[in-house]
């Protein structure tokens, strides 16, 4: 028996369900009751799911996973995962044994997509060319970790004097701020994109500074 | 009539080199996983290692990892143990079976043995 | 130490029935299934149950075989005199990814 599983990571969203494709190729005459599935956390071993003596046994992981029964008999071992959560990620192993045994293992990436970003200024008030100002990008609630990326008015990278921390709430997910501490010029656009590298998507903020008032 | 017929046992010293066969008949063996048990003098089974049926997936017990080797040679229909760095503790008959439903081995040969003594 | 745990010895007279237990945990027997392999003096093992219950072809049906959560056991009824043996539990185990046989139980028909 060969098992087979993507090659690709599964890429799953927070708080939507994920399928791990794990298939195998039965044997003419094969039937259920020969069939022992396994379904396991590859790096600790730790159980998740198992389909033996001709019976679903049920989830053995949070009570969030299922097979699916009607697909089995035609060699479709794939594991549903609901309502994923960060501590999910990982790599997870299909064991198959029937009268031969194999295994593979997929991959699951977990994402969440950050927030528009919102800009802050300090000073915010009586600001004139040649004044120091902070500016901080703050964008919530994504997976993985961001990368952050300011520009000015013309597209040029701003690399000195950006801060940038990400902290994690207890759901795992990132708050990332980032400061950039900038001379004025007589006006200007400064801009901040967050980026999640899983789901190449990029929220943008910005803040243009043109004597009063503030544009943001 | 299926049958496994193990050899290739004897006694070394510790320290030494075995390669224990296994020639099968009587089922397709190409079709089915296989494995190795063993059986120290007056012990119960502990089993050995596992090979599926094209030797891609391959599992061994912990109290032999990195020093044995189990392989197969479909074409031959014969499994194969290799046994490195021997330890008095590996005294043992050797098991050669045969893959079967839900994690059973429904075939077992008559067994080969294996004496490592100084 | 065996993963799965067997009583060393068991007895019974004949015509009676004895069973044998044997309890592993969710990883194994909970997660999967149960074998049973019976062991003649000085003869190789020989498959007597799997899949907990099912006998394969030849195995009188006084053998039977049971599964309960994370434990299960061996029962023969009618005991016989050529029924004095070694018996073995197995199982896969999930969290070590190796399969684990029980210590053995040695029955002595009396």
């Known amino acids: 028996v060969e098992v087979q599983v993507s090659e690709d990571p599964v890429v799953a969203l927070v708080d939507t369900d994920a399928t791990l494709r794990c298939s195998f190729s039965p044997e003419p005459g094969f039937s259920l009751a020969q069939l022992n599935l396994i379904w396991q956390l590859t790096d600790t071993k730790q159980l998740v799911h198992s389909f033996t003596e001709g019976r679903d046994q049920g989830s053995a992981y949070s009570n969030r996973t299922a097979l699916f029964p009607d697909l089995l008999v035609q060699g479709n071992a794939s594991l549903r995962l609901q309502r994923v959560r960060v501590t999910d990620e990982g790599s997870y192993t299909c064991f198959v044994s029937i009268q031969d045994f194999d295994s593979a293992a997929v991959s699951l990436q977990v994402a969440a997509p950050y927030s528009k970003p919102s800009m802050t200024l300090e000073p915010n008030k009586d600001l004139r060319p040649g004044n120091m100002v902070t500016i901080t990008c703050s964008s919530y609630q994504g997976y993985p970790e961001a990368e952050v990326f300011w520009k000015d008015g013309q597209g040029v990278p701003l690399t000195g004097n950006v801060t940038t921390s990400q902290m994690a709430n207890e759901r795992g997910l990132f708050d990332v701020h980032s400061v950039l501490r900038v001379v004025l010029g007589a006006n200007g656009t400064y801009s901040c994109l967050v980026r999640n590298p899983v789901l190449q998507q990029d929220a943008h903020g910005s803040v243009t500074i043109t004597g009063q008032p503030l544009t943001f | 009539e299926v049958q496994l017929l193990e050899s290739g046992g004897g006694l070394l010293q510790p320290g030494g080199s075995l390669r224990l066969s296994c020639a099968a008949s009587?089922?397709?063996?190409?079709?089915?996983?296989m494995h190795w048990v063993r059986q120290a003098p007056g012990k119960g089974l502990e089993w050995v290692a596992a090979?599926?049926?094209?030797?891609?997936?391959?599992y061994y017990a912990d109290s032999v990892k990195g020093r044995f080797t189990i392989s197969r040679d479909n074409s031959k229909n014969t499994l194969y143990l290799q046994m490195n760095s021997l330890r008095a503790e590996d005294t043992a008959v050797y098991y050669c079976?045969?893959?079967?439903?839900?994690?059973?081995?429904?075939?077992w040969g008559q067994g080969t043995t294996v004496t490592v003594s100084s | 130490q065996s993963v799965l745990t067997q009583p060393p010895s068991a007895s019974g007279t004949p015509g009676q029935r004895v069973t044998i237990s044997c309890s592993g945990s969710?990883?194994?027997?909970?997660?999967?299934?149960v074998n049973w392999y019976q062991q003649l003096p000085g003869t190789a093992p020989k498959l007597l149950i799997y899949?907990?219950?099912l006998r394969p072809s030849g195995v009188p049906d006084r053998f039977s075989g049971s599964k309960s959560g994370t434990s299960a056991s061996l029962a023969i009824s009618g005991l016989q005199s050529e029924d004095e043996a070694d018996y073995y539990c197995?199982?896969?185990?999930?969290?070590?990814?190796?399969?684990?046989f029980g210590g053995g139980t040695k029955l002595t028909v009396l």
């Open positions: 969710r990883s194994d027997i909970g997660a999967t299934t």
């Open positions: 090979i599926n049926s094209d030797g891609s997936r391959i």
């Open positions: 899949q907990s219950h």
């Open positions: 197995a199982s896969w185990d999930a969290s070590l990814n190796t399969w684990v």
């Open positions: 009587g089922f397709s063996f190409s079709s089915y996983g």
């Open positions: 079976t045969k893959y079967y439903y839900h994690y059973a081995m429904d075939v």
